[in-house]
């Protein structure tokens, strides 16, 4: 007889979730020397322990506890670029700015990105039909809260000049309900960090708004100096041309505001 | 009123130690970040190292980065400055200063002490 | 780090006389520069936070104007009491670095 399975309203657990996690671990490890020390099976020993098992509404940061511990991770803490509603970009920038780091460029970033998990409540079996969505079922889920830890773990590191970019075709250039707003905005260090400097994308080609004037953009400017800490905005018009200065400063065309 | 009063400065040879202390009145230490600022004789400002109001979280600047140690006591009101293998390149006057921070101002080094020269010489 | 550079690094000027200070960023600081003024054997004062605000207490003769990577200190008419040395400061990074320094001499 089968068991009956508990459904959630979010996507199952991404196929071959194990398989996944273990070969990033690898690729990860191989690619970073300073990570070549890292035991991949502990580590997807450490990430099934933080789910399997357990309840996938009721997950807690402390679950993570002992894959955060595998996966410690020391990034030049003044070349983090936090981003929101824009990830390839921010990736595409990072993958030629090889100095500068996403979280997803780091080793628990790079491990979960883009893929869904979760388990059962006493039973071993990963489950792939599926999981809970964070507004529709539970934010305990363990995909959010997982990411909710590596962010504040990644926002508590930072130092100096922070960088987010941002998505300016949204609605909400910036919203208070994105991880950025709700879990990094509030991790950043003040003292620590001494300026956050916000890249607002521009979608459109011929966008001349100045969207650093944006409600939304004077909201995340006012939480940020109440934390204490400076605030700066900047346009960028052309994604494009943005990247290809980034790719090759010295063109003449760089000179000009992208 | 404020007042920064720095001590410890003198004579040293290179590869000697020093360490300089600066007391803090008339403020609540404790809820400030501090640098320590250097003038080398007849040269301009170079920043040293900065340190967070709660002390978890240090700045140096290259040229001193390991050899120099900032650090506080904020039950004291003393900010330090534990300077290792000195350089002769490490002779100046050097300043406490107190870090500001408001929205208007953003951050600022408002109030300064009057120094203490450092000397580096065999 | 951020490299500020001012010029000119002297200047002569007489009483009365309009005075232009200039300090440009290695890269864009926004408007996180501040300018101060030092007297022989004094330590250095706030004069101008964030590019433009003068601090309590400084005559308004003081001005400043810029954004991005280049800014500048104007004396619009030099007293006796403003030959000193004048230092831009980068507040953008928290490793805050400071221009060499322009004096400002009798004629």
């Known amino acids: 007889v089968p068991r009956w399975r508990q459904q959630w309203s979010g996507p199952g657990t991404t196929k071959r979730f194990p398989e996944t996690v273990l070969a990033r671990c690898v690729k990860y490890t191989e690619i970073h020397p300073e990570m070549r020390h890292v035991d991949c099976q502990s580590v997807w020993d450490a990430f099934k322990g933080a789910f399997i098992s357990k309840h996938p509404c009721n997950i807690t940061e402390e679950d993570y506890q002992p894959l955060m511990k595998l996966g410690t991770q020391t990034v030049p803490c003044n070349k983090i670029l936090l981003w929101s509603r824009i990830k390839d970009l921010a990736h595409q920038f990072t993958q030629v700015q090889r100095d500068m780091f996403t979280l997803e460029d780091t080793l628990l970033g790079y491990l979960a990105d883009d893929l869904t998990w979760c388990g059962e409540f006493n039973t071993s079996k990963i489950n792939y039909q599926s999981c809970p969505d964070w507004r529709k079922d539970c934010s305990n889920n363990p995909v959010s809260v997982f990411w909710k830890t590596v962010s504040r773990r990644f926002a508590e590191a930072a130092c100096d000049v922070v960088h987010v970019m941002l998505n300016g075709s949204r609605s909400k250039i910036f919203d208070k309900n994105s991880t950025f707003g709700s879990v990094e905005v509030h991790n950043l260090q003040p003292e620590k960090v001494q300026t956050l400097e916000a890249w607002v994308i521009h979608g459109g080609r011929e966008d001349s708004r100045d969207l650093c004037q944006d409600p939304t953009i004077k909201e995340l400017e006012s939480i940020i100096s109440k934390r204490n800490i400076q605030f700066s905005c900047k346009n960028i018009y052309r994604p494009d041309k943005f990247l290809q200065c980034v790719k090759n400063p010295e063109d003449s065309s760089c000179t000009s505001e992208i | 009123q404020v007042q920064l009063v720095e001590s410890g400065g003198g004579l040293v040879q290179p590869g000697g130690s020093l360490r300089l202390s600066c007391a803090a009145s008339?403020?609540?230490?404790?809820?400030?970040?501090m640098h320590w600022v250097r003038q080398a004789p007849g040269k301009g400002l170079e920043w040293v190292s900065n340190?967070?109001?709660?002390?978890?979280?240090?700045y140096y600047a290259d040229s001193v980065k390991g050899r120099f140690t900032i650090s506080r006591d904020n039950s004291k009101n003393t900010l330090y400055l534990q300077m290792n293998s000195l350089r002769a390149e490490d002779t100046a006057v050097y300043y406490c200063?107190?870090?500001?921070?408001?929205?208007?101002?953003?951050?600022?080094?408002?109030?300064w002490g009057q120094g203490t020269l450092v000397t580096v010489s065999s | 780090d951020i490299q500020m550079t001012q010029s000119p690094s002297s200047l002569s000027a007489s009483v009365g006389d309009r005075v232009t200070i200039t300090c440009r960023a290695s890269?864009?600081?926004?408007?996180?520069l501040n300018w101060y003024q030092q007297k022989p054997g004094k330590a250095p004062k706030l004069l101008i936070y964030?590019?433009?605000n003068l601090q309590s207490g400084v005559p308004s003769r003081f001005s400043g104007s810029g954004s991005g990577t280049d800014f500048t200190l104007t004396i619009s008419s030099l007293q006796p009491e403003d030959f000193a040395t004048y230092y831009c400061?980068?507040?953008?990074?928290?490793?805050?670095?400071f221009g060499q320094g322009t004096k400002v001499e009798i004629k």
């Open positions: 200063a107190r870090r500001y921070w408001s929205k208007s101002h953003a951050s600022v080094t408002d109030y």
């Open positions: 008339g403020f609540t230490f404790s809820n400030y970040g």
């Open positions: 340190i967070r109001s709660d002390g978890s979280w240090t």
């Open positions: 890269q864009d600081i926004s408007a996180f």
């Open positions: 964030k590019v433009s």
């Open positions: 400061q980068q507040a953008y990074s928290g490793s805050i670095t």
